[in-house]
């Protein structure tokens, strides 16, 4: 929902969290603002207090229940409002009818680990976190490897077009330090976006055997 210079963007993590960011030029930093969630077919309402993240933007997480509980479905619509205190009253600053499964952003993959490392290749696995069982296998991943002397932005993206929670990196340089990250995205949802990148996993390839051709 956009009103002039106001922008209100929320994503559902597919289980029990709706994360929201509200941006407004010229808004007062010390004003108390809340995001209010009103589902169309649930018996609960939920609020979270918006906290400043920059000069003109605020964020909060609507925590709907235990992390792995399935609190919303594909048919739910949640009316989300930003309300800010003006004296003794609360003013609606932004509003949207939010379709959770059209606005997905999963949690970053976790538990990255090196399964097997050699001189030129490394097998890495990971797990997805708090992802709905509704997706079954309809997920895709992107991965990137940080090489010495390069930045993450320069790293080529490797795309896995299926639910595959491992990768075998090849053509690596022996005895070299690398870092690896992965992110995940459901195939469902018009406004669905990539998860944040995972925490980087550092690993080192094995040195080439002495006297052998590499």
């Amino acid at each position: 929902a956009v009103n002039g210079t106001s922008q209100f963007t929320c994503f559902y993590n597919s289980r029990a969290n709706i994360s929201c960011v509200w941006s407004q030029d010229g808004a007062l930093q010390d004003t108390s603002c809340q995001v209010h969630a009103w589902p169309d077919r649930r018996r609960w309402n939920q609020t979270c207090e918006l906290l400043p993240v920059s000069q003109a933007s605020w964020a909060c997480n609507l925590i709907l229940g235990a992390p792995d509980s399935q609190k919303l479905t594909t048919v739910d619509i949640v009316t989300l409002r930003v309300l800010c205190r003006e004296g003794v009253r609360w003013r609606v600053m932004a509003i949207q009818d939010f379709k959770p499964f059209e606005n997905l952003r999963l949690m970053a993959p976790i538990s990255l680990q090196v399964v097997h490392v050699e001189t030129h290749r490394c097998n890495i696995s990971w797990e997805i976190s708090q992802a709905s069982h509704y997706f079954e296998r309809h997920l895709e991943f992107e991965a990137r490897t940080l090489s010495p002397g390069h930045t993450w932005e320069e790293a080529p993206l490797l795309t896995l077009k299926q639910k595959q929670e491992w990768i075998c990196l090849e053509t690596l340089t022996p005895d070299t330090q690398y870092e690896f990250q992965v992110r995940v995205k459901p195939l469902q949802g018009e406004f669905t976006t990539w998860s944040p990148w995972s925490q980087p996993l550092a690993f080192r390839t094995k040195p080439a055997a002495l006297g052998k051709d590499t």
């Epitope: 809340q34 609960w44 309402n45 939920q46 979270c48 909060c60 709907l64 229940g65 235990a66 309300l83």
Partner: nanobody, 123 residues
Amino acid sequence: EVQLVESGGGLVQAGGSLRLSCVVSGDVFVRYTMAWFRQAPRKEREFVAVVTDSGRTTEYVDSVKGRFTVSRDNAKNTVYLQMNNLKPEDTAVYYCAANTDYFQIRSVDNNAWGQGTQVTVSS
């Protein structure tokens, strides 16, 4: 189902202090806006203080402003009410309340409640 257990009440002389605690279990604590209410004999239950899910914003009934401080520790699933400069008219049973909706918590109806802790202020 969320459960709330208060503690810290007691008998204190006017001008004294007490710190009430309320431990929350059975659900994710940071979902909840937390509040303190009190009920004096033969009176309605009244709102005392509220603290938002983040702990950043607090509000108080006029009669306790400057004397009472509400706070929360999200790591300990606990909300506190620090009561200073107590007056005989603060005598009541103090109740901890939880609601996932900040805008509903003062209305009493849909809150989860603790069992209450007695505070008696003698003159």
